[in-house]
Interface confidence: low
């Protein structure tokens, strides 16, 4: 016996968030892994008085304590619909079925005399049917439904007389069913029987407040189990050759402070006082845990030395329950001021360390959904995925000997103190129906797939490819708005006067009259901030730099009456100095952010993008920029993520769609102007960049979620892409969806109607497709009332906690970008595509491993799109150059310009042009390739200001 559970809270220093196997493991379970599902008799059988069954303490408790619950008589009626249960088991394809025998169905008053024939026949028929189907039965003798007569006559488990009566009942079951049953569970979760039955009064028999009674009940449950184990071991195991255990349930808990000894001590105490209370006598040294003995000496019964010897080792495996009943209500649990957690993997590790690595059967695991959820139990899939992933990690990475898993539960049924307000079944049952059909929920389909594949197969992504991007591929980095320096920070050589220093007198400088020195013209390097930009860009080794102008700085009045020439000079310097390093600019004219619209004040006060005249003001601004910078800039983005301005213009859907309309017109006007006036001489290309996250159905078994995923893309991307790239009008699917909601009175939104002239204006006003892609969203359909863009979509998002995610909860899902690129090509034809922003926030200030992982994986998928799918991908711009103070850390450089290690990683990908084969030598010609100029770099770094 080792008892070293507390070591689990000393965190593994080798944990790295980008080793995805430590978050989610794509692997299979051991070859003969035992897949099962469970029910409790009282929860599903119904027929509480039928065919001679006696009342249980729960039948009585329901009638006396639970409001609004008539009885368990309805439930799923498994007693009547046995065949339907068997069909459900067949559907899922389990290896075992764990069910419990209702003690009062066999012996109505609890005492073992002549068994109730109908009850005996029911269980016998069930066992025969399971054996016939090759489904192993795991039979629980006591799942909380004590015959009421024993409670009334003896006081239930408070009285040690029950121990022998329970042993008689067990003996009868071994005799009648043992030929067909190889796995026995004596008692299901004795902690809850004692704690909630006699402590909080939340469970039958509903007694509360007497701590001595709680621990007496626990004591008798342990002794009852031990007696039955010895009975089976001596009289039945030799010929029946089965195994017997007791199911012990627990929560899991994490310390508030992972390095704090006191907090870790409290966590150990918390686990010991729930799981250890029963596990220590049975799986440990035969006695209660030392901490409990000290703390509860006045109420905790004592085991004699002989009893300790008798208790110890009375389980053939460790049967473990981990589900909501041990977590709620939490304030009745030994929380000890620490943080309750659903980390099953850590709980299993604790069992391994505390009880010397036993073989473990997970005898109950799952969560719950609201009673109104029918067959689309999406969150249940993710809970199951998370739990199963943790079990798999425990087996594969921690070498824990888990040999089986019981999903809970087969059917919706009576959920103890929650009665019928929650559901835990993988099959939906309408309790008010006559036929009680078992309808498979999404979780049933999911579990079936897990069993069929014996784990998680990596179907989402294809293997990495080796290959390179084309020589003219733009390797970029994106920055948001560059605020121009209003005055050059370095004005030396601009003052023509000579001064002498009065060193001995007043220590001031005095101008020497009549002397004029030669000045030098202003230089780009007078701007300190440009020097910083160039240093960073040079280290990035990129070929392209995408940054945004500040409209409000260039045109403070919003029109051409007051042009800030200094700002334009600053931007021209950024571009020209970059070109000296071989770095071309992609310039964004307008880059609004959630916090700041970035409009000139007068336009902001005139209703911003709700005012159509803003579009004309934008055209004038764009014309000025094309004129002043267009000889140097060949790639233009008019507006960054106009499809995200819905976050700001969100008072109503009509505001959102009105603003979007004006943004589209603004872009089109600017593009037409460039096309007409500047393209002939400047030969550049103009587009707008759309926020383009991919969407997947949160629940792949629900048609409504597939439709929601496509609808997300229509509302998010097609909303702007369709009018510009294709038809000149909004997507028909989006228009029809909003109109349909309007007709049903669910929304008063409407997409603007476009005139023929507007359609002609918009259509075809892009020279390339620019997409900002960061993540993939998991979406589900949920009908939402209201007249806002967000509710018009009828979409909710789900966070998959098994996915690698950033601090701002951006999920790392590389294959989403490839799907996006294919979707764009399928919908909008074969055109040049630039990914104009793509990146992740990473807390690390130096070794930003998450960002390196993200870049490598996402660029792999972009390369697949290029090599395999033949998508015309022209460039990838990593987001972003430098982080901003107190914002999520997206930068390659910190806010005080310190370089992170992802820069070297990106350098390597750029210099290799992707992921070439070993010894690949397909270098580009000197003119095409952006060679790093060491002298240039030296000059940039050393040039005096």
């Amino acid at each position: 016996f080792s008892g070293d559970g507390r070591a689990i809270w000393s965190k593994n220093p080798n944990f790295t968030p980008v080793n995805e196997s430590q978050l989610f493991l794509y692997d299979t379970f051991p070859k003969n892994f035992f897949w099962g599902i469970g029910t409790g008799a009282l929860q599903v059988e119904g027929s509480w008085k039928k065919d001679g069954k006696g009342p249980s303490i729960w039948d009585h408790f329901i009638h006396t304590h639970l409001k609004n619950v008539s009885s368990t008589n309805g439930s799923s009626d498994s007693y009547i619909f046995l065949e339907k249960d068997l069909s459900a088991l067949d559907f899922i394809g389990v290896s075992f079925y764990q069910f419990s025998i209702s003690w009062p169905r066999l012996f109505p008053d609890g005492i073992v005399t002549v068994a109730n024939a109908k009850g005996l026949q029911y269980y016998s028929t069930l066992l025969d049917a399971l054996v016939l189907r090759n489904i192993e039965p795991i039979v629980t003798l006591y799942h909380w439904d004590l015959p009421l007569a024993l409670q009334e006559k003896y006081g239930g488990w408070k009285n040690d007389t029950i121990i022998d009566i329970f042993n008689d009942y067990a003996t009868y079951c071994f005799q009648m069913f043992g030929d067909r049953v190889k796995y026995w569970i004596t008692i299901h979760n004795p902690y809850l029987v004692a704690w909630h039955g006699y402590g909080t009064g939340m469970h039958a028999p509903g007694e509360k407040g007497n701590l001595a009674a709680v621990y007496t009940v626990g004591h008798n449950l342990i002794k009852a189990h031990s007696k039955v184990w010895h009975n089976y071991n001596t009289h039945f195991r030799p010929h029946q050759k089965g195994w017997l255990s007791i199911t012990l349930g627990s929560h899991w808990i994490e310390p508030n402070r992972s390095e704090n000894t006191m907090d870790i001590f409290k966590c150990q105490q918390s686990m010991v006082s729930v799981l250890g209370w029963f596990a220590n006598p049975i799986h440990g040294d035969g006695d209660y845990p030392e901490g409990m003995r000290k703390k509860l000496f006045s109420v905790l019964p004592i085991f004699s030395e002989a009893e300790k010897h008798e208790m110890r080792g009375t389980a053939d495996f460790f049967a473990f329950s981990f589900g909501p009943n041990n977590f709620k209500p939490l304030n009745t649990m030994a929380k000890m001021g620490q943080n309750v957690s659903l980390n099953l993997r850590e709980a299993l590790n604790w069992i391994k360390l505390e009880y010397n690595n036993p073989r473990i059967l997970i005898a109950e695991n799952g969560w719950f959904t609201d009673s109104r959820v029918k067959t689309e139990d999406t969150t249940a899939i993710y809970m199951m995925k998370n739990f199963l992933s943790q079990v798999l990690q425990a087996i594969r990475l921690d070498e824990i000997r888990v040999f089986g898993y019981t999903a809970w539960s087969l059917l919706d049924g009576f959920e103890w103190q929650d009665a019928y307000t929650i559901r835990r079944g993988l099959f939906y049952v309408d309790f008010n129906s006559k036929q009680k059909e078992r309808k498979p929920k999404s979780s049933a389909h999911y579990y079936k797939q897990i069993i069929r594949e014996n784990g998680f197969s990596l179907k989402e992504s294809t293997p990495d490819v080796q290959g390179q991007f084309p020589c003219d591929f733009s390797w970029g980095v994106t920055e948001s708005v560059l605020k121009p320096e209003s005055v050059a920070s370095s004005p030396q050589f601009s003052d023509p006067h000579l001064y002498v220093w009065n060193a001995t007198g007043n220590r001031l400088l005095h101008r020497v009259e009549g002397v004029r020195l030669k000045t030098r013209p202003a230089q780009c390097t007078d701007f300190v901030n440009i020097k910083k930009q160039l240093e960073m860009l040079a280290r990035m080794k990129v070929t392209h730099y995408r940054f945004a102008l500040d409209w409000a700085s260039v045109l403070p009045t919003g029109n051409l009456s007051a042009v800030n020439r200094q700002a334009l000079r600053y931007y021209r310097c950024v571009v020209s100095e970059g070109l000296k390093l071989g770095i071309s600019a992609m310039v964004t004219l307008y880059y609004p952010t959630h916090a700041h619209l970035g409009l000139p004040e007068p336009l902001l006060h005139a209703d911003g993008w709700l005012n159509p005249s803003t579009a004309e003001a934008f055209q004038a601004y764009a014309g000025l920029c094309f004129q002043e910078l267009g000889d140097l800039v060949k790639l233009w983005i008019t507006i960054n993520e106009p499809n995200r301005l819905s976050d700001i213009y969100n008072r109503s859907g009509n505001d959102t769609y009105g603003a979007a309309h004006n943004l589209l017109v603004a872009h089109a006007l600017a593009w037409r102007l460039y096309d007409r006036q500047f393209r002939p001489s400047q030969r550049g290309a103009v587009s707008l960049s759309l926020h383009a996250d991919w969407a997947e159905p949160a629940n792949p078994y629900a048609d409504s979620h597939w439709r929601a995923a496509e609808r997300f893309l229509q509302f998010e991307i097609a909303w702007f892409a369709e009018p510009l790239f294709k038809t000149g009008d909004y997507p028909a699917a989006m228009r029809e969806y909003i109109a349909s909601k309007h007709r049903r009175g669910l929304s008063s939104s409407a997409l603007p109607r476009l005139t023929e002239a507007e359609r002609r204006l918009l259509k075809g006003t892009v020279d390339f497709c620019a997409l900002n892609h960061f993540t993939t969203r998991f979406v589900m359909h949920e009908q939402l009332a209201g007249s806002r863009y967000d509710s018009d979509r009828d979409i909710q998002f789900l966070q998959d906690i098994t996915r690698l995610s950033s601090p701002t909860r951006l999920a790392v899902i590389p294959w989403g970008v490839r799907k996006l690129l294919r979707w764009v090509r399928r919908n909008y034809g074969d055109m040049d595509i630039y990914i104009t922003a793509s990146g992740i926030d990473d807390q690390a200030l130096e070794d930003d491993r998450l960002r390196k992982y993200y870049l490598g994986k996402y660029l792999q998928e972009v390369l697949k799109a290029y090599l395999i799918d033949k998508v015309r991908i022209k460039g990838y711009y990593a987001f972003k150059l430098a982080e901003e103070k107190s914002k999520p850390r997206f930068g390659f450089f910190t806010s005080d310009f310190k370089a992170k290690s992802s820069i070297q990683f990106y350098n390597k990908v750029i210099s290799s042009r992707g992921f070439p084969f070993e010894n690949s030598s397909s270098r580009c010609s000197q003119t095409q390739e952006n060679t790093e100029c060491t002298v240039c770099l030296f000059l940039v770094q050393k040039k005096p200001l």
């Epitope: 508030n256 977590f327 939490l330 304030n331 929380k335 000890m336 001021g337 309750v340 969150t379 909710q796």
Partner: antibody, heavy 124, light 109 residues
């Protein structure tokens, strides 16, 4: 963003019934992890919890006011309604509705978003 | 039913640390939430589940809970922290929300 807004009469006569409506936006009352409480605060006094409605439509009421309170919700309208019968001048207070979110089981993480409150005066 | 006891007032000089207590029978096994309420405004959640901070709440606000006392600690107190503070728990046995009587924090000077 998530908002809650209370509405109802400013003035109520003694013995009348008060009906208050909390209209929510930015989240769904269908959400299995969300509940809404009503709380009141008489002038210059402490907060007093009145009632709560859980995601599964279960209700819970303050023991001292249970006989006078009814809480309900209309998910389609995104509204939670509280009625309080037999009003008395001592019921003069600012009435707030607030959202609670569940993180595990039936365990709430505090009331993370509150309405701005509506002041009700009971006077003849 | 469950009762939470708070001191009616606490005074502290700017820059110092304020500690507001909330007493309750074995409160350490409950989850305690803390709210700040400024005059004429709705309460704002500043600490939940004993010690967690919602986004947007400064790190100066922290909480702890053990035994029979939960504590809200405000370090480097500023004039803008002057407000009423309430503790709250869910009484799981009755499914009732329980608030403390509130503590008025006064920032001196």
């Amino acid at each position: 963003q998530v908002t809650l807004k209370e509405s109802g009469p400013v003035l109520v006569k003694p013995t009348e019934t008060l009906t208050l409506t909390c209209t929510v936006s930015g989240f769904s009352l269908n959400n299995a992890r969300v509940g809404v409480s009503w709380i009141r605060q008489p002038p210059g006094k402490a907060l007093e919890w009145l009632a709560h409605i859980f995601s599964n439509d279960e209700k819970s009421y303050s023991t001292s006011l249970k006989s006078r309170l009814t809480i309900s919700k209309d998910t389609s309208k995104s509204q939670v309604v509280l009625t309080m019968t037999n009003m008395d001048p001592v019921d003069t207070a600012t009435y707030y509705c607030a959202r609670s979110v569940v993180t595990g089981g039936y365990y709430y993480d505090g009331m993370d978003v509150w309405g701005q409150g509506t002041t009700v005066t009971v006077s003849s | 039913s469950y009762v939470l006891t708070q001191p009616p007032s606490v005074s502290v000089a700017p820059g110092q640390t304020a500690r507001i207590t909330c007493g309750g029978s074995n409160i350490g096994s409950e989850s305690v939430h803390w709210y700040q309420q400024k005059p004429g405004q709705a309460p704002v959640l500043v600490v939940y589940d004993d010690s967690d901070r919602p986004s947007g709440i400064p790190e100066r606000f922290s909480g702890s809970n053990s035994g029979n006392t939960a504590t809200l600690t405000i370090s480097r107190v500023e004039a803008g922290d002057e407000a009423d503070y309430y503790c709250q728990v869910w009484d799981g046995n009755s499914d009732h929300v329980v608030f403390g009587g509130g503590t008025k924090l006064t920032v001196l000077g």
